[in-house]
Every structure is written in structure tokens, then in C-alpha cells.
């Protein structure tokens, strides 16, 4: 799997999309996990509803939400109030039994808020030793959500 890069601005929301074959993964729950080192395990952050038929319902774990369009074949993860420590390598997964198939590898990069004049030295970017060949960059710089606003995925 190639790695897709999603960039978001610190303090704002970042939406990550993972397309998949809706028939191949029919009936399977999905998950979002964080890779612990390039060869390490992938630690589950959040998974879709326990009942696959209700996968469209958004589920939250802390500031991370997941929702699955099982007909269209798109898994959407929202990272709300993005922080420097959210940067890193993640995976979208399709679950069957205790197994997980990787749908997409995702590198999250956190950009400094241009309106925030604090030191950006702690913002994380992959160093030379962590370069990701053939990584595809998707800029997903979004505004902060208003109080009570539902973070719907883009309709395009």
C-alpha cells in the first residue's frame, strides 16, 4: 500500500477519506488505527458501530470520529481540534473476525496555524529517516467547526 498524506492545520478539523470496494468489504466493520513505528502494531483508535447496518452513525473516541458510507464505499475519519501529537502514520482497516485488512495507509501532517504566533518547533513532520516514497498528498485544510456544528463529510 502506498501512503496518502493528509495535511491539516493545528486547532482545526481534518477529514481523512478511505475509499474501498463496497462489495469486497460488504458486511465488514471498519476501524482507524495508529501505527506504532513503521513495523510495529497498529493501535485501534476508533471503530464503526458494532452493528454493520448502523455504520453510517458517527462514532467518537475523544476527538476522533468515524463514519462509513457502506454503499458508496468511503470510510471517513474526522480529527477534531488537530494537535501536533496527532501527526503520524495511521491505517484505515476492514475487519473480519479478529483479522484486519488495510484499506489505506495515511500519514497525517499537522501544519502550524498561520494565525497562531507561538513557536511551531514542536510540530511534527516526517524526517529523512521516515520518508514515505510515492506518498500521495491530499491537502485537507478545513476551518474550525462552529459550536454544535455537525462535521458532515464533503458531498462532492
Amino acid at each position: 500500500h502506498n501512503t496518502t498524506v493528509f495535511q491539516g492545520v493545528a486547532g482545526q478539523s481534518l477529514q481523512v477519506s478511505c475509499p474501498y470496494d463496497s462489495m469486497k468489504h460488504w458486511g465488514r466493520r471498519k476501524a482507524w488505527c495508529r501505527q506504532l513505528g513503521e513495523k510495529g502494531p497498529c493501535q485501534r483508535v476508533v471503530s464503526t458501530h458494532n452493528l454493520w447496518l448502523l455504520s453510517f452513525l458517527r462514532r467518537w473516541n475523544g476527538s476522533t470520529a468515524i463514519t462509513d458510507d457502506t454503499l458508496g464505499g468511503t470510510l471517513t475519519i474526522t480529527l477534531r481540534n488537530l494537535q501536533p501529537h496527532d501527526a503520524g502514520l495511521y491505517q484505515c482497516q476492514s475487519l473480519h473476525g479478529s483479522e484486519a485488512d488495510t484499506l489505506r495507509k495515511v500519514l497525517v501532517e499537522v501544519l502550524a496555524d498561520p494565525l497562531d504566533h507561538r513557536d511551531a518547533g514542536d510540530l511534527w513532520f516526517p524526517g529523512e529517516s521516515e520518508s514515505f516514497e510515492d506518498a500521495h498528498v491530499e491537502h485537507s485544510i478545513s476551518r474550525s467547526l462552529l459550536e454544535g456544528e455537525i462535521p458532515f463529510p464533503p458531498t462532492s
Epitope: D21, M23, K24, W26, G27, R28, R29, L51, W52, L53, L95, H96, G97, S98, E99
Partner: antibody, heavy 123, light 107 residues
């Protein structure tokens, strides 16, 4: 009606090659995984591997990796199991089975099976 | 690989009897277990999936229970057509593995 129809019995000599088939009908062949299962004479069932005909994504059991090749031709709704060099120990009944994901528990079970292909390898 | 162990390996019973077959997994498999029936010269037939869900068209005298490592298949009142070999199968992880089978014979 969902059906998996397998090719007929084969008698081969050690070292020969063989390709057996499993043709699906009555459902969308490209939308379900197909597994191959071996049953040696008088023995239990052994899962060999699986293929998704839609994109030919294939998984093998470690026991069969490198020993057999699983493939599919979605244009004719057929999955295949092949050997490049048969051994006497390959003598068995081979079943193909459709794998269905049941959304209740997001796991996979074999809901339809072919009638089996008996492969006999003897010098 | 997960090992599946069935007991007994064979059982003799009469029409009308209640029969229980057990299956034990070498590690926890949640409820990811299926039961199949196979008659001589025929392909296996799915009876139970997800440990306790009855497959369409399977008579209600068949039932399954259990989770984790211990599972049972129960036939509440044996019918002549039930004499066959029964296999359990885990759907937890690859490779999928089957029990060695339980042969149900007429007493």
C-alpha cells in the same frame, strides 16, 4: 439458484501439472470470495486459500503457499486451483466454496459449496 | 494457527435422541464459529454460523451455543437424515481451520 459447479475427476501422474475449475452461477460472481478446501481420503477439511474474483486478491494458508496457485477469470465466472508438479500426497477431494460475510458479526462463512473434484495422483 | 478439537470423534444414537457435539478452540475466537454437516460423497453444508445463528433452510432442531473457546452443536431430536459427519470451523483468523469431525452413526 446459487450454484458452484466444479470440473470432473482427474487421474494424473506425479510431476504432471493440473488446473481444476469452479464455475459460479445464480449470483454476482465478482462480489463474493471463493475458497478452496482440501479433503484427503477419510480425513477432515483443510482450508487452502481464497480469492476475490473482482480484483483477484488472493490469500493462502502457509501450508499451501507455493504448492498451488489460486486464480479466477471473472469474465466467465470461474475460479481455478492449479498445480505445476503434482505429488502422490495431493490425492484428495477438492472443494470450492463461496464465502459470505454475515453482517451480524462481520465474519465469513462458507454458505455454498461445489460438488468437489476428486484428484488422484498415482504412478 | 488455531487448533479446533471436536469431541467425541464418533457417537452412536437413535432416531429421536438428543445429541450434543462439542468443539474447543486453542485460543479465544469470540463467536466466530460455524458448524457444517457432511454426508458421504457430498460437499459440506452450512448449518450454524456466528456460533448460534441458524442458516436459512436448516431445521430448528439444530442449535449452536458457546463463545470464547468452548462451543456446542445440539440436535434436539435426531432424524434419519441427520446421520452424517459434523465439522466445526473457526472464522476468527487466517488460516481458517476445521475440527477433525464427529461421525454420527445409527445405534
Amino acid at each position: 439458484e446459487v450454484q458452484l459447479v466444479q470440473s470432473g475427476a482427474e487421474v494424473k501422474k506425479p510431476g504432471e501439472s493440473l488446473k481444476i475449475s469452479c464455475k459460479g452461477s445464480g449470483y454476482s460472481f465478482t462480489s463474493y470470495w471463493i475458497a478452496w478446501v482440501r479433503q484427503m481420503p477419510g480425513k477432515g477439511l483443510e482450508w487452502m486459500g481464497i480469492i476475490y474474483p473482482g480484483d483477484s486478491d488472493t490469500r493462502y494458508s502457509n501450508s499451501f503457499q507455493g504448492q498451488v496457485t489460486i486464480s479466477a477469470d471473472k469474465s466467465i465466472s470461474t475460479a481455478y486451483l492449479q498445480w505445476s508438479s503434482l505429488k502422490a500426497s495431493d490425492t484428495a477431494m477438492y472443494f470450492c466454496a463461496r464465502q459470505r460475510t454475515f453482517y451480524y458479526d462481520s465474519s465469513d462463512y462458507f454458505d455454498y459449496w461445489g460438488q468437489g473434484t476428486l484428484v488422484t495422483v498415482s504412478s | 494457527d488455531i487448533q479446533m478439537t471436536q469431541s467425541p470423534s464418533s457417537v452412536s444414537a437413535s432416531v429421536g435422541d438428543r445429541v450434543t457435539i462439542t468443539c474447543r478452540a486453542s485460543q479465544g475466537i469470540s463467536s466466530w464459529l460455524a458448524w457444517y454437516q457432511q454426508k458421504p460423497g457430498k460437499a459440506p453444508k452450512l448449518l450454524i454460523y456466528a456460533a448460534s445463528s441458524l442458516q436459512n433452510g436448516v431445521p430448528s432442531r439444530f442449535s449452536g451455543s458457546g463463545s470464547g473457546t468452548d462451543f456446542t452443536l445440539t440436535i434436539s431430536s435426531l432424524q434419519p437424515e441427520d446421520f452424517a459427519t459434523y465439522f466445526c470451523q473457526q472464522a476468527d483468523s487466517f488460516p481458517r481451520t476445521f475440527g477433525q469431525g464427529t461421525k454420527l452413526e445409527i445405534k
